[in-house]
Interface confidence: low
Amino acid sequence: KLTIESTPFNVAEGKEVLLLVHNLPQHLFGYSWYKGERVDGNRQIIGYVIGTQQATPGPAYSGREIIYPNASLLIQNIIQNDTGFYTLHVIKSDLVNEEATGQFRVYPELPKPSISSNNSKPVEDKDAVAFTCEPETQDATYLWWVNNQSLPVSPRLQLSNGNRTLTLFNVTRNDTASYKCETQNPVSARRSDSVILNVLYGPDAPTISPLNTSYRSGENLNLSCHAASNPPAQYSWFVNGTFQQSTQELFIPNITVNNSGSYTCQAHNSDTGLNRTTVTTITVYAEPPKPFITSNNSNPVEDEDAVALTCEPEIQNTTYLWWVNNQSLPVSPRLQLSNDNRTLTLLSVTRNDVGPYECGIQNKLSVDHSDPVILNVLYGPDDPTISPSYTYYRPGVNLSLSCHAASNPPAQYSWLIDGNIQQHTQELFISNITEKNSGLYTCQANNSASGHSRTTVKTITVSAELPKPSISSNNSKPVEDKDAVAFTCEPEAQNTTYLWWVNGQSLPVSPRLQLSNGNRTLTLFNVTRNDARAYVCGIQNSVSANRSDPVTLDVLYGPDTPIISPPDSSYLSGANLNLSCHSASNPSPQYSWRINGIPQQHTQVLFIAKITPNNNGTYACFVSNLATGRNNSIVKSITVSASGTSPGLSA
């Protein structure tokens, strides 16, 4: 079927469009183009006769149309009126006619837009501003940008008039920004220049600096006032209600006690018509007063709170000094002094930070000291300790347990046996115990100020028979020539003798072996690989004796200097080279090879088939023990002779 395709469909004014004909029939006499959706002689643009290859303009021909032999029509220098439908009338040789209609739309190349505003100096929290994107253009889409970002979502921003108008209600100083608008249609998009919104605001409540309010007689008083304001504020000063001057700064040289009083700064914005004031009270001392320390936290909690100690009063041009425990301040990342040295901050206080603290003010002849201040640091309770440490008792003796936990204020204690509350005391006493008194003894310590509690549980066994002991170790994998190991025989029992055996023999005499803690603890200093033996402890009293299971010490060592085998260093060409590397090490080492410094495989054995003189060189075996963090290596030179030149025999 005959069809017309417009390329492009949307055309910019001044550009060109091609009405492309598809499925043109065979055996044609000629064809004509018409403006509109039907064949109308008055609206003929151009006709074309194939036989003569003659094009004839029609009444609607504008001089901008070109017809091609394939019936396509090119229209150049497009104008708005060209929008619409175009009909192709095809006359076949058999005089049977065919028609097809196509269309395109014409859009203007958009001009660069500009922004108009209904209010060039809006007042904060009072005025609205409406920006309008000019000119108004048919079939155009309008977009807005604030600081080159698309519009934020805000109830104070409203688009209207087909997005042509952007209204900001109740403007704020934060609306001072760069605004741009953009127009788009199917053939173009243009952005305006920026418009900067100038929002009038303030004055805010002024701030008077410096902040200090105490001065010494004879000093200069220099106060400065500032209030956020657009346009900038005009300032006035009043002392005790009496107008002084219309300046931003107030300067009074060589002040006396008579200059004490209330100082008021008034800020005025002539455009908004608003005034704001701030008052500061200035005290002038004839001589510096005795300093004193104020604290922002009288009962700080350990590891939780910070404490700021401030030396009062605040006096301008004064040197402040601090002492802790009658010493000058130690260097510590937890101690921080403010810029003027007036405030000492203790970050994350500990129980050792109690003080006493003193501050001083330097005057002409001496230093005035404050009274000392002690910090009451709340801490704990720490994990309570139950004493004595015995866990085995014989029937008939008295059980007397005492509990203690470091705490401020002092902890309150409770005792539980097998989870049942017994008494609220620091000591627990039970006379003439029996096997029935065996169980779990819990001491609970509570700090009422911090609300924290900690508990310790001890298993008490009352028995005539001693239990089977066990060995605990402080280091399960010691490193040779570096670590020490302490074995302890558990449990701790009253009136008990402790014994030790190594590989079934009593302890050898050695300066590296030491017994302590009533022979309960055996310490091996600077362990060696030969200490990797079976250790057994025994306990005995007048009634019974018992031995532990053996504990074997796993000593990490090596790697020692490796050995490469076979030892041969000369080979014949064509032989297989099979080098094996071994190093004493616990755990087993990792092996790697290098030939002439070039890394090879990570294996214990290096195999090269049919070697030649090209394989001459240095063969290095590297060993590393990840557990000890130690490395070792050995290098071997290999010489390969060409056949028949070997200095030795070959197999």
Epitope: N10, L110, T141, S150, Q184, S188, A189
Partner: antibody, heavy 120, light 106 residues
Framework: QVQLVQSGAEVKKPGASVKVSCKAS????????MHWVRQAPGQGLEWMGW????????EYAPKFQGRVTMTRDTSISTAYMELSRLRSDDTAVYYC?????????????WGQGTLVTVSS | DIQMTQSPSSLSASVGDRVTITCRAS?????MHWYQQKPGKAPKLLIY???NLASGVPSRFSGSGSGTDFTLTISSLQPEDFATYYC?????????FGGGTKLEIK
Amino acid sequence: QVQLVQSGAEVKKPGASVKVSCKASGFNIKDSYMHWVRQAPGQGLEWMGWIDPENGDTEYAPKFQGRVTMTRDTSISTAYMELSRLRSDDTAVYYCNEGTPTGPYYFDYWGQGTLVTVSS
Amino acid sequence: DIQMTQSPSSLSASVGDRVTITCRASSSVSYMHWYQQKPGKAPKLLIYSTSNLASGVPSRFSGSGSGTDFTLTISSLQPEDFATYYCQQRSSYPLTFGGGTKLEIK
């Protein structure tokens, strides 16, 4: 005819910066915006921003704000895109594209692409 | 940012089939562009401003839609049409592309 020729592939370490160039011919660079679009391996297309070579104005995608800098040298008809503080997920092919300043931001001319690999 | 969701993400079809690819925007956009990309090559513009065929693109490609829903249609698939197709919105910064639709031979 319009042509955009980009600089060659780059391999960079994390934390480093890369600067890709795009030389234009067949049109006046001042009459166009130069856009930059990237494509991570096996992923889709991601627009980074544009520069107006006439005055140096830029528009960056928020994702790249603070890390990307687009510049130009009109005397040699070349646009540049520099990306700093590189991460491994910046590995991508970076394309420059020409778009008319009045145009509706579509890209009918593309550079051949520059592969930037970020690896430690 | 306006998110562009293309469906389907991949599609198997035969030569001669009619194929439709959909692109949905997370908020309303004014126009949509479509690109075709073949492996190892830069993308190629197919359709701009929703329905306009780019220069040299065959008429079997067409585009339509408005608001948030747009479609690319290939009326009769040809062997050279097997590629990945991307949509792109141009209404709001940052400009964003769809995740792509890979068109494969069945």
